[in-house]
């Protein structure tokens, strides 16, 4: 039953003398395992014997024995699915039909495979894409319908006989579908590859040449152009003629249009390979190129820079930067269209030639106000000297100069006066817009740059002003020199350092903090009475009578100032003690009698002691001694002693007489 045998293998296999052939093959016998296999060369069916005749290249029997001469041909299959074969080496006379005679228990089958063996290695085949365009990556494929495990080969790419630098990727296929070796080369052709010969060379494992295939590359590319100019250096003078010629060195496909461009813009009505420029003007200077197009696109030549030479044009001056700040650096640039470039320059400042300045640029490292003005220049080249242009104005800005503060008042200024000051300056650029004053005060500015100080203080020593534009310039401070009466007059005790005791030597000083003018006079006064005209008031031996309220006065030409009243206090021991008796020195018994110890003391008496006629101290210590009821025996002389921090004082005796009352007399 033929439908039970299914085979898969390449239809035809290719090889050459001395190589080998590897035949990938699979089969399926539905009724069981393979029992017998014979490989025929050009088998023919014999109807008489009902068998196949032909050369038997390989035979396997049930016992698995293979004749020794069959080593060249190997059956690499198995009993149920693999029928792969190998012939190594393969010979020219192996060409033809191979017949695989397969037998199972009940079925038989003859499978035919074509084998094409050539005398010499056959060439590979180069496959090119339908179109190759410059700079577009393409893949070149070299295909050889051969591959065999026992015969390694290699495919090498050559360009104009030289191995190509690009890496090729080689792949092999030994499958039931196809047998081949393939090399793929990716590369980006340039226009110069057009017409060049590419070879794919088949080599054996040792690199020995076996065969090759060759193609000439057809690389589509934009026109490749060369531009020629007369004169060759493309340097002419106004009025000369120039000829430019565009040569197409290569174009594929053929070119269709020609045009000329200047500075990237197409020139109208110029559509031939020659561009004639007659009586050129300087405006025709620029970059010229020709453009030729084909179906791939436009090609452009290199640019030719046409220089039309002419004498310098009227110059202009560019200032970096104006306005300039005093002290900064400034650069002047002389700009004049000229070809060739100017070689010499003459510079002018306010119409006067600047000596030693012959360069295109003038650099002033430190600008001063006098540098301001109009700058102009003249450029010169080999063709002539240009005209002086209008020039450029340099504005030099600086802070106000020579700022002074001026006192408008007649001198001297007295405390309390109204003072007017003005802020003056010599020059300023830009103009002064405001003024500042130091120190700050609640002062009036009746007009710009004028300061009015009403009721000027004694301590308004100095005033400074600043005139301001973009910057402020301060004047040196001006002294107001305000005159005033002596200030802070006070009495100061110089000695003694401690409290004043009666008899001490005492010095008082009349002090003041300041006076303008400095020349002063002093006056001492006690209770409206003038005591002296020195700064000091001296007591050789102070007495309690010197105590009192003292003032000193200091005066100068502006006025006089009195100190606060200063109290002079003299400390002394109790004095002028006396005992006074109330109601009198004669008192009736039974009544009350009060003895008072009167004294003069500073500080006041702090402790009293009472004594009787026997100088016996009595147990009483207050200023008053109260006897109640008074007795006759109280009669006698009494005295008291007063004590303070300075010392003690005693009174003279005072006699108290106590007389009997009428009752006592009546009893007697």
């Amino acid at each position: 039953d033929s439908s039970k045998w299914v085979f898969e293998h390449p239809e035809t296999l290719y090889a050459w003398e001395g190589a080998c052939v590897w035949i990938p093959c699979t089969y399926r016998a539905l009724d069981g395992d393979l029992e017998s296999f014979i490989l025929f060369h050009n088998p023919e069916y014999n109807k008489n014997t009902s068998k196949f005749d032909g050369t038997r290249l390989y035979e396997s029997t049930k016992d698995g024995k293979v004749p020794s001469e069959q080593k060249r041909v190997q059956f690499l299959g198995d009993k149920n699915k693999n029928c792969t074969l190998s012939i190594h080496p393969v010979h020219l006379n192996d060409s033809g039909q191979l017949g695989l005679r397969m037998e199972s228990k009940t079925e038989k089958w003859m499978e035919r495979i074509h084998l094409n063996v050539s005398e010499r290695p056959f060439p590979p085949h180069i496959q090119l894409p339908p179109e190759i365009q410059e700079s577009q990556e393409v893949t070149l494929t070299c295909l050889l319908n051969f591959s065999c495990y026992g015969y390694p080969i290699q495919l090498q790419w050559l360009l104009e006989g030289v191995p190509m630098r690009q890496a090729a990727v080689t792949s092999t296929s030994l499958t039931i579908k196809s047998v081949f070796t393939r090399s793929e080369l990716k590369f980006s052709p340039q226009w110069s590859h057009h017409g060049k010969i590419v070879t794919c060379q088949l080599q054996d494992a040792d690199g020995k040449f076996l065969s090759n295939d060759t193609v000439q590359l057809n690389v589509k590319h934009t026109p490749k152009l060369e531009i020629k100019v007369t004169p060759s250096d493309a340097i002419v003078r106004e009025g000369d003629s120039v000829t430019m010629t565009c040569e197409v060195s290569s174009s594929n496909p053929e070119y269709t249009t020609v045009s000329w461009l200047k500075d990237g813009t197409s020139l109208k009505k110029q559509n031939t390979f020659t561009l004639n420029l007659r009586e050129v003007t300087k405006d025709q200077s620029g970059k010229y190129c020709c453009q030729v197009s084909n179906d791939v696109g436009p090609g452009r030549s290199e640019e030719v820079f046409l220089q039309v030479q002419y004498a310098p044009e009227p110059s202009t001056v560019q200032i970096l930067h104006s306005p300039a700040v005093e002290g900064s650096q400034v650069e002047f640039l002389c700009m004049s269209l000229a070809n060739p470039l100017p070689t010499n320059y003459t510079w002018y400042h306010n119409g006067k030639e600047m000596q030693g300045r012959t360069e295109e640029k003038v650099h002033i490292p430190k600008i001063l106000p006098w540098h301001a003005g109009t700058y102009s220049c003249v450029a010169e080249n080999i063709l002539g000297t240009g005209q002086r242009g209008p020039g450029a104005e340099l504005d030099v800005q600086y802070p106000p100069k020579k700022v002074t503060t001026v006192i408008q008042n007649p001198m001297p200024i007295r405390e309390g006066d109204t003072v007017t000051l003005s802020c003056n300056y010599n020059s300023s650029n830009p103009s002064v817009t405001r003024y500042e004053w130091k120190p700050h005060g609640a002062w009036e500015e009746p007009s710009l740059g004028v300061l009015k100080i009403q009721n000027v203080g004694w301590d308004n020593t100095t005033i400074a002003c600043a005139a301001c534009n973009s910057w402020c310039s301060w004047a040196s401070p001006v002294a107001l020199n305000v005159q005033y009466a002596p200030r802070d007059v006070r009495v100061r005790k110089i000695k003694p350092l401690s409290e004043i005791h009666s008899g001490n030597s005492v010095s008082l000083q009349c002090d003041f903090s300041s006076s303008h003018p400095k020349e002063v006079q002093f006056f001492w006064e006690k209770n409206g009475r003038l005591l002296g005209k020195e700064s000091q008031l001296n007591f050789d031996s102070i007495s309690p009578e010197d105590a009192g309220s003292y003032s000193c006065w200091v005066n100068n030409s502006i006025g006089q100032t009195a100190s606060k009243a200063w109290t002079l206090e003299v400390l002394y021991a109790p004095r002028r003690l006396r005992v006074s008796m109330s109601p009198g020195d004669q008192v009736m018994e039974g009544k009350s009698a009060t003895l008072t110890c009167e004294s003069d003391a500073n500080p006041p008496v702090s402790h009293y002691t009472w004594f009787d006629w026997n100088n016996q101290s009595l147990p009483y210590h207050s200023q008053k001694l109260r006897l109640e009821p008074v007795k006759v025996q109280h009669s006698g002389a009494y005295w008291c002693q007063g004590t303070n921090s300075v010392g003690k004082g005693r009174s003279p005796l005072s006699t108290l007489t106590v007389y009997y009352s009428p009752e006592t007399i009546g009893r007697r």
């Epitope: 090119l128 360009l159 104009e160 006989g161 590859h193 060049k196 070879t199 000439q216 060195s249």
Partner: antibody, heavy 116, light 112 residues
């Protein structure tokens, strides 16, 4: 060995056309471009154009572009050059040639005489 | 197209003399991929097709006598015959094949 065998001499009248052949042998015809070059008496060699037999792509010298047609028959390994609107100045020897990497092969030439 | 200008147009020398002829190209014929100059020199005798003498500007074709040598690169090339023989009487053409093909006007060599 490589050979380029050209057809025999031609005599044509002005305004007519001529078609001459170049049979290649000894190499794979489709592998190389085939060029046509002419030489008028006492004049320099002048390239006319080529054909790539692999894909019939042609490229011509602009001077001949409107009058020349180059074709190829790969089965016969033969290239043809047809020149139309003949003028007396087309009187020349016409060569087919091809380049290999390191050499050039030339046909023996076909003489064309254009005369009234 | 690339224009080739040959000089001189003709020259007459005695047998055994050294002779040089020049070929100037309007553009470089150096091919950057293999650093070869795509310029050939031919000898053409009356009634014969051109015979290749030199390719790649300086490589002598096999079978060409070694008295013929080529030199130059880029745009300027020279063919030298070190010792002229009577059989060298011919027209010599230079040929660029970098881009399309163009030929020089030829230099005619005669023997005095």
């Amino acid at each position: 060995q490589v050979q380029l065998q050209q057809s025999g001499a031609e005599v044509k009248k002005p305004g007519a056309s001529v078609k001459m052949s170049c049979k290649a042998s000894g190499y794979t015809f489709t592998s190389y471009w085939l060029h046509w070059v002419r030489q008028a008496p006492g004049q320099r060699l002048e390239w006319m154009g080529y054909i790539n037999p692999r894909n019939d792509y042609t490229e011509y010298n602009q001077n001949f572009k409107d009058r020349v047609t180059i074709t190829a028959d790969t089965s016969a390994s033969t290239a043809y050059m047809e020149l139309s609107s003949l003028r007396s100045e087309d009187t020349a020897v016409y060569y087919c040639a091809r380049r290999d990497i390191t050499t050039f092969y030339w046909g023996q030439g076909t003489t064309l005489t254009v005369s009234s | 197209d690339i224009v080739l200008t040959q000089s001189p147009d003709s020259l007459a020398v005695s047998a055994g003399e050294r002779v040089t002829m020049n070929c100037k190209s309007s553009q470089s014929v150096l091919y950057s991929a293999n650093h070869k100059n795509y310029l050939a020199w031919y000898q053409q005798k009356p009634g014969q097709p051109p015979k290749l003498l030199i390719y790649w500007a300086s490589t002598r074709e096999s079978g060409v006598p070694d008295r013929f040598s080529g030199s130059g690169s880029g745009t300027d090339f020279t063919l030298t015959i070190s010792s002229v023989q009577a059989e060298d009487v011919a027209i010599y053409y230079c040929h660029q094949y970098l881009s399309s093909w163009t030929f020089g006007g030829g230099t005619k060599l005669e023997i005095k």
